[in-house]
């Protein structure tokens, strides 16, 4: 769905895409884990939150994230199908008033405290990938995805077809 030619063509246009309305389509809580079943966890350290990718001990409770789904116009000047081109974006909030943010300068994923309306850095285009895995593409930097690097979440540039389906940008959502 996000082939290289597609990614390059949308780099400029995606910045201009507008989110339809301010209220989400739907919201629900889910735990987030990697393709290899490591859990994404959040810990409060020195008044800021850290994000970890780790194996949980047996019976250890998984952290939940509030996923809020928004519908956005897919840039129609490129897609050629007018107003009908749409995409889903999500924001991810593990705790009240904190949202995952893309820090494109540092290629990092951070938790920031902020008020609504949320900045563009908090929005990720949702892709359904292998079976029931999803990927999260930065709204502010198309072709860049949330991924796993050295047991942390990081931003990973997907710049060749072979890298598109690498396991480190695939995540599982579980509501149980």
């Amino acid at each position: 769905a996000f082939g290289i030619s597609g990614v390059q063509k949308y780099t400029r246009a995606l910045h201009d895409s507008s989110i339809t309305g301010i209220s989400p389509i739907t919201e629900y809580l889910a735990s987030l884990s990697t393709y290899n079943d490591q859990s994404i966890t959040f810990a409060l350290e020195d008044e800021s939150y850290e994000i970890y990718v780790e194996d949980l001990k047996k019976d250890e409770k998984k952290d939940k994230v509030l996923l809020s789904y928004y519908e956005s116009q897919h840039p129609s000047n490129e897609s050629g199908d007018g107003v009908d081109g749409k995409m889903l974006m999500v924001t991810l909030s593990p705790t009240k008033d904190f949202w995952l943010h893309a820090n494109n300068k540092e290629h990092s994923v951070e938790l920031h405290k902020c008020e609504k309306p949320l900045p563009d850095q908090a929005f990720f285009v949702l892709h359904n990938m292998h079976s029931n895995c999803v990927s999260f593409e930065c709204k502010t930097d198309p072709g860049v995805f949330i991924g796993v690097k050295d047991n942390h979440l990081a931003l990973i540039k997907v710049d060749s077809s072979e890298n598109l389906c690498t396991e480190n940008i695939l995540f599982k959502l579980s509501e149980t």
Epitope: A1, F2, S5, G6, E78, D81, V125, N128, N132, S161
Partner: antibody, heavy 122, light 107 residues
Framework: QVQLQQSGNDLVKPGASVKLSCKAS????????INWIKQRPGQGLEWIGR????????SYNELFKDKATLTVDTSSSTAYIQLGSLSSEDSAVYFC???????????????WGQGTLVTVSA | DIQMNQSPSSLSASLGDTITITCHAS??????LSWYQQKPGNIPKLLIY???TLHTGVPSRFNGSGSGTGFTLTISSLQPEDIATYYC?????????FGAGTKLEVK
């Protein structure tokens, strides 16, 4: 406007294989997944699988994993499905369909090809 | 796999009637449900996505509602061109699955 043009109907012998095509126009082919759906005469709809033309990435319904092979040719904006070891159970109309949302199957299928009827008969 | 239980399997109504088709998902699919209309010999046509949003060009007499596991398609003031088979489809998880269909006929 978005269009999906499928190849013509096919009559094939049991045990043979067949390759159907779906040519897309009116949008950026590499940006939306193409799905394949089967409909037996007088029956309902069954999802076979989907392919991302930009990457060639594929997701199959387990029921069709040994039956169908999905491919694309981005230079001609065409998706293909190859059906192998055909039997009477495979006699059906096969549709290609483009997803509503960029990157996501949550919104269903907004655009459909006209369908290709495959008849398996000796 | 998520099973989609659609009812009734067939329905006979008079022109001008309001009819209701229901779809029940075997697990929570939130709002990720689509409805299609298929006329004999034709292709399926997307009517409603996201449980309640009308696709472009679909008349307002079609109405979708529900979330979670229970969904409804309502057609008010039935028209001759509405005679078709209607399918629900869940888009929550792979494999994507359809209801068995509801064949709508005129009395």
């Amino acid at each position: 406007q978005v269009q999906l043009q499928q190849s013509g109907n096919d009559l094939v012998k049991p045990g043979a294989s067949v390759k159907l095509s779906c040519k897309a126009s009116g949008y950026t082919f590499t940006s939306y997944w193409i799905n394949w759906i089967k409909q037996r005469p007088g029956q309902g709809l069954e999802w076979i699988g989907r392919i991302a033309p930009g990457s060639g990435f594929i997701s199959y319904n387990e029921l069709f994993k040994d039956k169908a092979t999905l491919t694309v040719d981005t230079s001609s904006s065409t998706a293909y499905i190859q059906l192998g070891s055909l039997s009477s159970e495979d006699s059906a109309v096969y549709f290609c369909a483009r997803e509503f949302y960029y990157g996501s199957f949550y919104g269903g299928f907004a655009y459909w090809g006209q369908g290709t009827l495959v008849t398996v008969s000796a | 796999d998520i099973q989609m239980n659609q009812s009734p399997s067939s329905l006979s109504a008079s022109l001008g009637d309001t009819i209701t088709i229901t779809c029940h998902a075997s697990q929570n699919i939130h709002v990720w449900l689509s409805w299609y209309q298929q006329k004999p010999g034709n292709i399926p046509k997307l009517l409603i996505y996201k449980a309640s949003t009308l696709h472009t060009g679909v008349p307002s007499r079609f109405n979708g509602s529900g979330s979670g596991t229970g969904f409804t398609l309502t057609i008010s003031s039935l028209q001759p061109e509405d005679i078709a088979t209607y399918y629900c489809q869940q888009g929550q998880s792979s494999p994507l699955t359809f209801g068995a269909g509801t064949k709508l006929e005129v009395k």
